[in-house]
Interface confidence: low
């Protein structure tokens, strides 16, 4: 049984009747096949469900799909397949839902082989109505919405053409041929790579990076000898082939590719890769793969320009390009990230950082857990978290770690307690302080989700047998109650709640199987009557984030400031509500050396907060390439950590002088960059 299932638990009274009145079953008139579900808009209650069923015939595959719509968070569904003329929808493209609350939806249809182009169904009223549009091309990718204007769409065709629509898919124009990869930037800018000779694969490392800021009227070549590119926060990254050999280096731009600087990162060879693990407007986490097929690399964290990098974590587990990494941003607490390292003995261990990659440490052993067989010392061990890598290895882990920005401090994850990740059946652990301390929450693997900004946690046991029981907790996972939502158990396939964790509805998806047929079924449970009243001021308590030593004036200082949050008391059973906004009071901290990273030409010796000059650069003029010019740096070795808000205290001096020398590093310098018009 789950920890806390004892008499001391604050029970929610009469919950069975309250939940029974708010449990809604919908049986889909459908053969099983596959199902995909999308939420349309925020707080609209609109859900689209697409069921597809393939009938393999001798010569071809005959497909059938059905489209259902709910506008009450999944309590009731209406079959709207006729709105898309009973057309078979291609599930590999999914349902392309527009940004924000645009209410836009694009479905890509399956068409017969000989047709001139593809077909889409478009809705701009939250899927109440659809318009059929025949395309002048066959799409290779899902339609991509401009983040700034949901009327602007781009898509790649099967013939590598870049197509753009300015009227939400009504009319399409091919703006460029021979395109490998295209992405929306900010301000409706499109970045894309093109090949000149054979193909995307053949020209890898010889691609050109182009930009259009006017949807294809004019173009600018912003890079050559490109291997690939990526966008992260306000940074544009490109990996560029070196002149002399097959290595490549990362270049970075913060002005949409007008000027470039070489990132102070190791170059990589043909078999290696770079990966942007996380990026925001302040900084970036970059993974650089080790040479050879090691399965690991090094995490570097950038300065505010994305140019100077500090080594953050060695032996970071990342299997292959596009492979698996456990790197997870804990969104419920600023500065916290969790990932896995491959230790010397090839075991996998979890590491956590609370200061945006400054320092990494093992996760503290949960109070209520014993060390498992992987532990050499039965009294000293750590918690190790199962994430993407474990899931890819088909371990009994149904879900990755979960955190939500509006459920402050809460992190839920599968894990094991020992010296390394164990292949044994994991349990579910919870942290209520952003990863500093952990408690075993549920025995064995579960699906879990957060409702009402953390006011309710819902879980379902991961089992191969049919299930009919759901567990819920109103005190951040300390105590659990079980509710039987149906007499007839179902084969469970998924738990769905509205993104953002503000909803009080949960949908349990599964199928029923009888001798003759199997059908999709959903149960939607509304917890509003469990949380009978709205939360008041007395239901919240002050919590200082990142607090480790209440006697220290610096307690809670991370990246130069501390934050006090108003958090729901565990004992309060009430509704945060859909409009709940996290209340936080920041206060600035004094600067110490911890608030600075080591500047170019400097490094931090192990367990020291001072930056010292790199021996090989001692006595040399510090010159480096910035915005395509040689710069001279006068520094005492420190640069403020991106996003750090400290004031006063230690204030190291830093000055950069322009040496007026060019250093384009085989990248086009601004003077050479040519503009082209259509």
């Amino acid at each position: 049984s789950a920890p806390g299932e004892d008499e001391e638990c604050g029970r929610v009274r009469d919950f069975v009747a309250k939940l029974a009145n708010n449990t809604h079953q919908h049986v889909f008139d459908d053969l099983r096949g596959s199902v995909s579900l999308s939420w349309v808009g925020d707080s609209t209650g609109v859900i689209l469900v697409l069921t597809t069923f393939h009938v393999p015939l001798v010569i071809m595959t005959f497909g059938q799909s059905k489209l259902y719509r709910s506008e009450d968070y999944g309590k009731n569904f209406k079959d709207i397949t006729d709105l898309i003329n009973n057309t078979f929808i291609r599930t590999e493209f999914g349902m392309a839902i527009g940004p924000e609350n645009s209410g836009k939806v694009v479905l890509t249809a399956e068409v017969s082989g000989g047709s001139r182009g593809g077909r889409i169904f478009r809705s701009s009223d939250f899927a109440k109505n659809f318009v059929q549009t025949d395309l002048p091309f066959h799409p290779l990718t899902q339609m991509m919405y401009s983040p700034q204007n949901s009327d602007y769409l781009l898509a790649l065709s099967t013939e590598n053409g870049l197509w753009v629509s300015k009227n939400f898919g009504g009319k399409w124009e091919e703006i460029h041929k021979a395109v490998c990869l295209a992405k929306w930037g900010s301000d409706n800018t499109i970045f894309f790579t093109t090949y000149a000779n054979g193909s995307c694969k053949a020209d890898l490392g010889a691609l050109e990076l182009w930009r259009t800021s006017d949807l294809g009227k004019s173009f600018k070549t912003i890079g050559v000898k490109i291997y690939s590119f990526g966008l992260g926060g306000r940074f544009l990254f490109a990996s560029v082939m070196a002149d002399k050999d097959t290595t490549r280096r990362i270049h970075v731009s913060t002005d949409q590719g007008d000027t470039w600087s070489m990132a102070q990162l190791p170059s990589v060879g043909q078999e290696q890769f770079y990966s942007i693990l996380a990026a925001n407007d302040d900084m970036v986490f970059m993974h650089v793969d080790e040479p050879g097929d090691t399965g690991f690399g090094t995490i570097f964290t950038s300065d505010d320009r994305g140019i100077v990098y500090s080594k953050s974590l060695d032996r970071h587990l990342y299997t292959t390009t596009g492979g698996e990494t456990d790197f997870t941003n804990v969104t419920s607490l600023r500065g916290v990230y969790i990932t896995s390292v491959l230790s010397e003995d090839n075991s996998i261990q979890t590491m956590i950082t609370f200061d945006q990659g400054g320092r990494w440490t093992h996760l503290r052993k949960p109070e209520n857990s014993e060390c498992d067989a992987t532990a050499k010392n039965k009294n000293e061990c750590s918690l190790h978290i199962h994430a993407s890598y474990s899931i890819s290895q088909k371990l009994n882990v149904p879900m990755a770690p979960l955190s939500e920005p509006n459920a402050v401090g809460i992190v839920i994850a599968h894990g094991s307690v020992g010296d390394a990740i164990s292949v044994m059946v994991p349990d579910v652990y919870i942290s209520d302080d952003g990863g500093y301390s952990w408690t075993k929450m549920l025995e064995g693997p579960h699906y879990y989700t957060i409702l009402d900004s953390g006011g309710i946690i819902v879980a379902i046991e991961h089992s191969s047998r049919p299930i009919n029981v759901i567990k819920f907790s109103t005190d951040e996972g300390q105590c659990w109650q079980t509710y039987t939502f149906t007499r007839d158990p179902i084969y469970f396939t998924g738990l769905a709640s509205e993104p953002g964790a503000r909803s009080m509805n949960i949908s349990i998806w599964g199928f029923t199987e009888s001798a003759l047929t199997s059908q999709w079924v959903s149960y939607t449970i509304d917890f509003k009557d469990i949380l009978e009243r709205n939360c008041e001021e007395k239901d919240y308590t002050i919590w200082l984030a990142h607090s480790t030593d209440p006697e220290d004036y610096e307690d809670g200082c991370i990246l130069g400031y501390k934050e006090q949050f108003l958090r729901l008391r565990k004992s309060s059973v009430c509704q945060n509500g859909r409009d709940y906004v996290v209340t936080k009071q920041p206060s600035i901290c004094l600067c110490s050396l911890e608030d600075f990273l080591c500047d170019f030409g400097y490094y931090r010796p192990e367990n020291d907060s001072k930056c010292v000059e790199q021996p090989e650069l001692k006595g040399h003029d510090l010159e480096f390439c910035l915005y395509g010019r040689e710069e001279h740096l006068t520094t005492n070795g420190y640069r403020k950590i991106p996003g750090d808000k400290c004031q006063g205290g230690v204030n190291p001096v830093r000055e950069v002088k322009d040496l007026k020398k060019k250093c384009t590093s085989n990248f086009l310098s601004p003077e050479k960059q040519n503009s082209k018009s259509n």
């Epitope: 209440p550 220290d552 610096e554 206060s587 110490s592 050396l593 911890e594 004031q647 006063g648 204030n651």
Partner: antibody, heavy 129, light 107 residues
Framework: QVQLVQSGAEVKKPGASVKVSCKAS????????MSWVRQAPGQGLEWMGI????????SYAQKFQGRVTMTRDTSTSTVYMELSSLRSEDTAVYYC??????????????????????WGQGTTVTVSS | EIVMTQSPATLSVSPGERATLSCRAS??????LAWYQQKPGQAPRLLIY???TRATGIPARFSGSGSGTEFTLTISSLQSEDFAVYYC?????????FGGGTKVEIK
């Protein structure tokens, strides 16, 4: 010697704004924060906010958020406090005070508060229709 | 925010006697506390910082003690110039907050 000299008394109508200045001398202006504290007639002291003269960054008490703006001019070693949308309850003496929050003791983990050690003479602001 | 509560509101003491003023914080402020003296028509003056360290030029008869949530300012032998209002102030967590003050008057 170290001193803070504030601008003279002001009489303002409700809804107006007031800008009080505080000129520092006798020490390195950028080496210390500056706090602003007010005192209504017959009442206690109320902290309004703090400014770091180095970069001009500020931290305001919630009560004054949106109404108060603290700025500094390093060329004249002067800090300013502007309060807008004045109401009668803003009638008070406004003090600037040197706040050595900007001193870090040795080592990153040690924080030590030295108190507001130098105060201006105060500026009386009267809000009346 | 951290609430600072001073007691008593008024303390009547004869010159030469000992005065003990109390200050309580709603949560721990460690030793990040200062005491100020204010006389009518004047700006406050720093007496004690770091809960127990006398500021420059402050006579030895003033002493501070305490840490966490309970603090005390002691004036061992009151002089005529010591009759004033005394405030405590925390600087552990923003916003800085003051106590309501204790008025020390002649008995």
């Amino acid at each position: 010697q170290v001193q803070l000299v504030q601008s003279g008394a002001e009489v303002k109508k409700p809804g107006a704004s007031v800008k009080v200045s505080c000129k520092a001398s006798g020490y390195t202006f950028t080496s210390r924060y500056m706090s602003w504290v007010r005192q209504a007639p017959g009442q206690g002291l109320e902290w309004m906010g703090i400014i770091n003269p180095v970069g001009g960054s500020t931290s305001y008490a919630q009560k004054f958020q949106g109404r108060v703006t603290m700025t500094r001019d390093t060329s004249t070693s002067t800090v300013y406090m502007e309060l807008s949308s004045l109401r009668s309850e803003d009638t008070a003496v406004y003090y600037c005070a040197r706040d050595p929050s900007g001193i870090a003791a040795a080592g990153p983990a040690s924080r030590y508060y030295y108190g507001m050690d130098v105060w201006g003479q105060g500026t009386t602001v009267t809000v009346s229709s | 925010e951290i609430v600072m509560t001073q007691s008593p509101a008024t303390l009547s003491v004869s010159p030469g006697e000992r005065a003990t003023l109390s200050c309580r914080a709603s949560q721990s402020v460690s030793s990040n506390l200062a005491w100020y003296q204010q006389k009518p028509g004047q700006a406050p003056r720093l007496l004690i910082y770091g809960a127990s360290t006398r500021a420059t030029g402050i006579p030895a008869r003033f002493s501070g003690s305490g840490s966490g949530t309970e603090f005390t300012l002691t004036i061992s032998s009151l002089q005529s110039e010591d009759f004033a209002v005394y405030y405590c102030q925390q600087a552990r967590l923003g916003p800085w907050t003051f106590g309501g003050g204790t008025k020390v008057e002649i008995k």
